[in-house]
Amino acid sequence: TQNKALPENVKYGIVLDAGSSHTSLYIYKWPAEKENDTGVVHQVEECRVKGPGISKFVQKVNEIGIYLTDCMERAREVIPRSQHQETPVYLGATAGMRLLRMESEELADRVLDVVERSLSNYPFDFQGARIITGQEEGAYGWITINYLLGKFSQKTRWFSIVPYETNNQETFGALDLGGASTQVTFVPQNQTIESPDNALQFRLYGKDYNVYTHSFLCYGKDQALWQKLAKDIQVASNEILRDPCFHPGYKKVVNVSDLYKTPCTKRFEMTLPFQQFEIQGIGNYQQCHQSILELFNTSYCPYSQCAFNGIFLPPLQGDFGAFSAFYFVMKFLNLTSEKVSQEKVTEMMKKFCAQPWEEIKTSYAGVKEKYLSEYCFSGTYILSLLLQGYHFTADSWEHIHFIGKIQGSDAGWTLGYMLNLTNMIPAEQPLSTPLSHSTYV
């Protein structure tokens, strides 16, 4: 007679990443009896919510419920019904909501309130919706990639092959690029973190980590583009903005009211003699790059060294995983290979940006024009941010690994967030029996 398969003793968790441009739902799964082991949690599903980020629902909060329905229903299908009630659901909102809160705490609260009410209607164990800090976003991204790379444990990992040559236990730094903010997080080498705001101390699996992190609000790729447009329109002689960051032949009309809607463009705001202006692409990488560099103030530094805007940055150390939009943009541009030098990346960007818009549209017929039109800017911005902002060089470029997934789990802050909130990262190295929760971070 055949043996009957024993029911799988597994647990699930759900995290919603409410970003500035969209919301994604992630479902994680792990063996119940191995909760304290490193590397056992993995992603089983990602569901991208159709529509913009939740901050865009400020004038139509009644639509939030419908907006979240498809992905929450997908979670209902993926997770066995018997597990629904004990599956935690967390929603973390990032820089898009931080910006909304800067404009109006009341409006941000209203959006989160409706989100919470919508998510409470599902049969899961809803644990709340909150705006996470930039520091948390950086820290959880760092935890995620190092957890997935098996950096927190000497023990054999649950998967056989780990990418990115990770025999040693030196952690990877994390570079995260979103639509509204960007984070840099790493363990500096024997360096005091001169700015207390940028210092984090963790004890994970019996080891202490002194981590540097900073989140640059308004320096995500979308807000950086708004900043650049607001800066450049100041010196335009009329309502035509000849823009080197868009392909030759590209044209787009922009409302001045949209340009000044975000707090990120406040420093460039001025009274313009027109309500609209037209972007006309001229496709010149060098000029685009030069324009972007003007967004980084490098003339002031109250520390031994800075990234930009007077923010402390220790000397770079170790390898870095660059994920989220760093990966999506570079993947589209076919520049994620470890073998591509910084000089080659620059050469390819020059060629890409110089391609006529009509030619680009034909070559990438399946890509939405709104996204397609911005890859020249985004790619140039990534280079500018890494090279000028964070001081990577031609020599150290090889230490940047553009990562989408690690062993099937997306690189990003969500997994680290859930691991922390479900107490699955012990402070001490677990023995054969799980430790008491009092020792967890």
Partner: antibody, heavy 116, light 110 residues
């Protein structure tokens, strides 16, 4: 501190090893460089050894020089000296592990004279 | 690649005056530039790094500026002790380059 030694008068073609001895510097955390200066001339970059033992050389120095290290010393081998290699040789510590933008601690230098 | 051209080769300045030294990179090096001071018979001394950050213990009379390919070192309120040769150095690419240093500028104080 950083101190160079091994500089002396050598005949052309005789290999010479210069040693940079460091104290209070963790060579697994810092990059080190060799720079030379011919009499009355400017500074000339030879090469570096990074914290992870990777070496970089100036284009003209490849094959002519070899840089290696132990836990407390960094060696520069001049494989086949010529009279043009007559110079003061400096060893310097980098301001980072691999993003080596500047050299913030220099030795006093050691003089190498190549003459027949 | 990444050749550094320093101008002028020599400059004379009166005590209390201001001197400006220029450094041009053949390719973009972002802010990865340092300035050094070297007096005869002495080792070089780091003055400025990341184009504009003053090294520890260096007088604020020394000011670095620029990014990309054009950089400037300005010494204001020149003193006799400033008589030296000044070098710029790029730290953007250390591999397979001819020289990371500029040719040097001799500052003569009268």
């Amino acid at each position: 501190s950083v101190e160079e030694s091994g500089g002396r008068l050598v005949t052309p073609g005789t290999p010479l090893t210069l040693t940079c001895t460091v104290s209070g510097i963790d060579l697994s955390s810092n990059a080190m460089s060799w720079v030379r200066q011919a009499p009355g001339k400017g500074l000339e970059y030879i090469g570096i050894i990074r914290n992870n033992d990777i070496t970089y050389y100036a284009s003209w120095a490849k094959g002519r020089f070899t840089i290696s290290k132990t836990s407390t010393t960094v060696d520069l081998i001049i494989t086949s000296p010529t009279t043009e290699d007559t110079a003061t040789y400096f060893c310097a510590r980098g301001g980072g592990s691999y993003s080596i933008v500047f050299w913030n601690l220099w030795g006093p230098g050691t003089l190498v004279t190549v003459s027949s | 690649a990444y050749d550094m051209t320093q101008t002028p080769a020599s400059v004379e300045v009166a005590v209390g005056g201001t001197v400006t030294i220029n450094c041009q990179a053949s390719e973009r090096i972002y802010s990865n530039l340092a300035w050094y001071q070297q007096k005869p018979g002495q080792r070089p001394k780091l003055l400025i790094y990341y184009a504009s950050t003053l090294a520890s213990g260096v007088s604020s009379r020394f000011k670095g500026s620029g990014s990309g390919t054009q950089f400037t070192l300005t010494i204001s309120g020149v003193q006799c002790a400033d008589a030296a040769t000044y070098y710029c150095q790029q730290g953007y690419s250390n591999n397979n380059v001819d020289n990371t240093f500029g040719g040097g500028t001799e500052v003569v104080v009268r």
